[in-house]
Interface confidence: low
């Protein structure tokens, strides 16, 4: 099949780093500066991604692979391939349209990114609050009085935090 395909489609012989130039009888031309092709048989080279502004270059563009960006200090990546940079906040804060805001009472954020999440409701599991929550930390649930029997575990770890999917508008 590959042999048949290459006979019918001269472009299939063009390796990565080149493009099949229809203007030149379908010869393989090197990708122009600032462009790349990551697979063979391509009829174009893609313009390299430019890591500018709040983005910084993690990997330079080559003729066969696109540049990869990450974010400058104080920002973190969001989206596939770091398509956005979002401002970091402090622990105990979340990013809103108006900037970093402290978590409301009853919520916490233990990371520099994402949203404030409600403290674990210990009573839902029949537990009591062993350590109070703060803006930066969830509550720690302890045993209810009925659980204080020999051999019972004294501390239940907080529920795992769900991954926030928040980005500013």
């Amino acid at each position: 099949f590959e042999r048949t395909r290459s006979l019918q489609d001269p472009c299939s012989n063009c390796p990565a780093g080149t493009f099949c130039d229809n203007n030149r009888n379908q010869i393989c031309s090197p990708c122009p500066p600032n462009s790349f092709s990551s697979a063979g048989g391509q009829r174009t080279c893609d313009i390299c991604r430019q890591c500018k502004g709040v983005f910084r270059t993690r990997k330079e563009c080559s003729s066969t692979s696109n540049a990869e960006c990450d974010c400058t200090p104080g920002f973190h990546c969001l989206g596939a391939g770091c398509s956005m940079c979002e401002q970091d906040c402090k622990q105990g804060q979340e990013l809103t349209k108006k900037g970093c805001k402290d978590c409301c009472f009853g919520t916490f954020n233990d990371q520099k990114r994402g949203i404030c999440r409600p403290w674990t409701n210990c009573s839902l599991d029949g537990k009591s609050v062993l350590v109070n929550g703060t803006k930066e930390r969830d509550v720690v649930c302890g045993p209810s009085p009925a659980d204080l029997s020999p051999g019972a575990s004294s501390v239940t770890p907080p529920a795992p935090a769900r991954e926030p999917g928040h980005s500013p508008q």
Partner: antibody, heavy 116, light 107 residues
């Protein structure tokens, strides 16, 4: 804000040379390639090619090889289009355009009139 | 070069109408299509890139769609200020090539 400001209109005779400037501001000049586009009177847009603002390497469309030259003055965040040996058919408005997956910001255009 | 054909040179519409401007590529261009608006005496402005992504600040009445060889720019509710020339452009191969333009006229 991002701006591309081009030099003023030019009236030239056939055989002369014209050099058009395109000064960029509001972003890091060397982060984006600069494209040049021709629009003849009453006609559509035609890509002339582009220049890599990091390396200064130009790429010309087939119809614009020979008499046309792209260049840079990176310290002044300025790109240039020079047309040598002007012909009547070079009468057009020439636009510079910053490129980031598309021509996202454009200069206001420079009108070049070639007439004897 | 890839030829981008905008079959309607002129389109007449009324304020508030929905209008679709079409563009056909001479070969599959894999959604590598942009749309530009050029008002009389002005430079072109980017509306849409990658076939459907709106550029910064473009009103949401402008939407792009399509795949393969056929692409459409739709204005959901035409405003008087939308009187302009609209160009499609491919960047699937170099050089990028533009369609011939569609002039939107307001009745």
């Amino acid at each position: 804000q991002i701006q591309l400001v081009q030099s003023g209109p030019e009236l030239k005779k056939p055989g002369e040379t014209v050099k058009i400037s395109c000064k960029a501001s509001g972003y890091t000049f060397t982060d984006y390639s600069m494209h040049w586009v021709k629009q003849a009177p009453g006609k559509g847009l035609k890509s002339m090619g582009w220049i890599n603002t990091e390396t200064g390497e130009p790429t010309y469309a087939d119809d614009f090889k020979g008499r046309f030259a792209f260049s840079l003055e990176s310290s002044a965040s300025t790109a240039y289009l020079q047309i040598n040996n002007l012909k009547n058919e070079d009468t057009a408005t020439y636009f510079c355009a910053r490129y980031d997956y598309a021509m996202d910001y454009w200069g206001q255009g420079t009108s070049v009139t070639v007439s004897s | 070069d890839i030829v981008m054909t905008q079959s309607h040179k002129f389109m007449s519409t009324s304020v508030g109408d929905r209008v679709s401007i079409t563009c056909k590529a001479s070969q599959d261009v894999s959604s590598a299509v942009a749309w530009y608006q050029q008002k009389p005496g002005q430079f072109p402005k980017l509306l849409i890139y990658w076939a459907s992504i709106r550029h910064t600040g473009v009103p949401d009445r402008f939407t792009g769609s399509g795949a393969g060889t056929d692409y459409t720019l739709t204005i959901s509710s035409v405003q008087a200020e939308d009187l302009a020339l609209y160009y499609c452009q491919q960047r699937y191969t170099t050089p990028p090539t533009f369609g011939g333009g569609t002039k939107l006229e307001i009745k």
